[in-house]
């Protein structure tokens, strides 16, 4: 079965998480994409999504999350600005492909946010600046609700080196109205996805 891997990001409060999810294939370019948080034993929750169809280089903002889809490079850029300790947790990008279940992208992102200022790299933005300048053309997009009769797969156990996710709900303004419960793709499902096994080793997150 395909191993679900994680990439760890350790940042300070006020900094910006800036990552790119790699979707590689052209057939996914216009598909709606989403940024989700995964809590142990729960279905992933969608925090933000692109428009449907996804527009090229067109930022979508939901609270402190900004998504930008770059069709020409097969990359979904995800920024979470003004990070808070409560944002710590496990995240993933998915591609919606109804009526099929969403296609999960590698790797998952393990975000650890700690208190206190640090000048260390980890953000493209000025760490001292808590107010992020949102591009003027950003729009909001509603995320679809998918229901599935299939059972939910347990999220993989966190390593002892990882910081556990706080019990409190993630502190993202204007996001609760579009949060949707989302099924996690099982490892068996992944093997039957549109990307064949012979290609999977090329599709790791950078």
């Amino acid at each position: 079965a395909t191993k679900l891997t994680e990439e760890k990001y350790e940042l300070k409060e006020g900094q910006t998480l800036d990552v790119a999810c790699d979707y590689t294939l052209e057939k996914f370019a216009s598909s709606q994409k989403a940024w989700q948080i995964i809590r142990d034993g729960e279905m992933p929750k969608t925090l933000a999504c692109t428009e449907r169809p996804s527009k090229n280089s067109h930022p979508v903002q939901v609270g402190r999350i900004i998504l930008e889809d770059y069709h020409d490079h097969g990359l979904l850029r995800v920024r979470m600005v003004n990070l808070q300790v409560e944002d710590s947790g496990l995240y993933q990008c998915v591609i919606y492909q109804p009526p099929k279940e969403p296609h999960m992208l590698f790797d998952r992102i393990r975000l650890v946010v700690t208190k206190g200022f640090s000048g260390t790299p980890g953000s493209n933005e000025n760490s001292t600046q808590n107010v992020y300048k949102i591009p003027p053309t950003t729009t909001k997009a509603l995320c679809p609700l998918y229901t599935s009769p299939r059972t939910v797969t347990q999220a993989p156990p966190k390593s002892t080196a990882d910081v556990s996710t706080p019990d409190s709900e993630i502190n993202l303004t204007n996001v609760t109205d579009i949060i949707r419960e989302q099924k996690l793709i099982s490892e068996e499902d992944l093997e039957q996805k549109l990307i064949s096994e012979e290609d999977l080793h090329h599709h790791h997150h950078h």
Partner: antibody, heavy 121, light 111 residues
Framework: EVQLVESGGGLVQPGGSLKLSCAAS????????MHWVRQASGKGLEWVGR??????????YYAASVKGRFTISRDDSKNTAYLQMNSLKTEDTAVYYC????????????WGQGTLVTVSS | DIVLTQSPDSLAVSLGERATINCRAS??????????LHWYQQKPGQPPKLLIY???NLESGVPDRFSGSGSGTDFTLTISSLQAEDVAVYYC?????????FGQGTKLEIK
């Protein structure tokens, strides 16, 4: 196993035309962009152009040296990519390779063995 | 067009020694944290073979004595301990922008 097999090479006079084919197998052909790369004897590699997938409206891109003379096409039902070469010049003499990338702007993981095109009078 | 310049043009290294090939781009080949720069090995009479993709990722089946590094405009291919079968021409290639381009190649020989 992914396989790419080029055919159609040969001797042609300057100003003439030739059409190369690249027969693909072992993968879902329609999912990937296909490229042509050439190499003159004893020289380096030169990217010729690429054709994207149906979801990108089969968009094509070319190196400046062949633009307007060469045309890349594909037939997904036949798992085949083509390189139509017109107004051939002696400097087009090379081994022409068909390659498959690993996705949008990704690396060339698979190559054919190449077919030799000789432009000479 | 992005011009890739490899150095040196040719290189002679003793067996077991380290070989280093550089590739400089005329402009950045990065998009976000991704470098769209790849390395290939070509032996006489054969098509090129992918070694390293996106600057630092080792292609499956390639010996781990090969490694890649760099970002932006400056990249390096390193062979940590040269083996006889590594004699070949090595090319860098960028796919960040159209037209895609290759470096001119570096010929690696045994000293």
């Amino acid at each position: 196993e992914v396989q790419l097999v080029e055919s159609g090479g040969g001797l042609v006079q300057p100003g003439g035309s030739l059409k190369l084919s690249c027969a693909a197998s072992g993968f879902t052909f329609s999912t990937y962009a296909m490229h042509w790369v050439r190499q003159a004897s004893g020289k380096g590699l030169e990217w010729v152009g690429r054709i994207r997938t149906k979801s990108s409206n089969y968009a094509t891109y070319y190196a400046a040296s062949v633009k307007g003379r060469f045309t890349i096409s594909r037939d997904d039902s036949k798992n085949t990519a083509y390189l139509q070469m017109n107004s051939l010049k002696t400097e087009d003499t090379a081994v022409y390779y068909c390659t498959r990338d690993m996705g949008i702007r990704r690396q060339f993981a698979y190559w054919g063995q190449g077919t030799l095109v000789t432009v000479s009078s | 067009d992005i011009v890739l310049t490899q150095s040196p043009d040719s290189l002679a290294v003793s067996l077991g020694e380290r070989a280093t090939i550089n590739c400089r781009a005329s402009e950045s080949v990065d998009t976000f944290d991704y470098s769209f720069l790849h390395w290939y090995q070509q032996k006489p009479g054969q098509p090129p073979k992918l070694l390293i993709y996106r600057a630092s990722n080792l292609e499956s089946g390639v010996p781990d004595r090969f490694s890649g590094s760099g970002s932006g405009t400056d990249f390096t291919l390193t062979i940590s301990s040269l083996q006889a079968e590594d004699v070949a021409v090595y090319y860098c290639q960028q796919s960040n922008e159209d037209p895609y381009t290759f470096g001119q190649g570096t010929k690696l020989e045994i000293k």
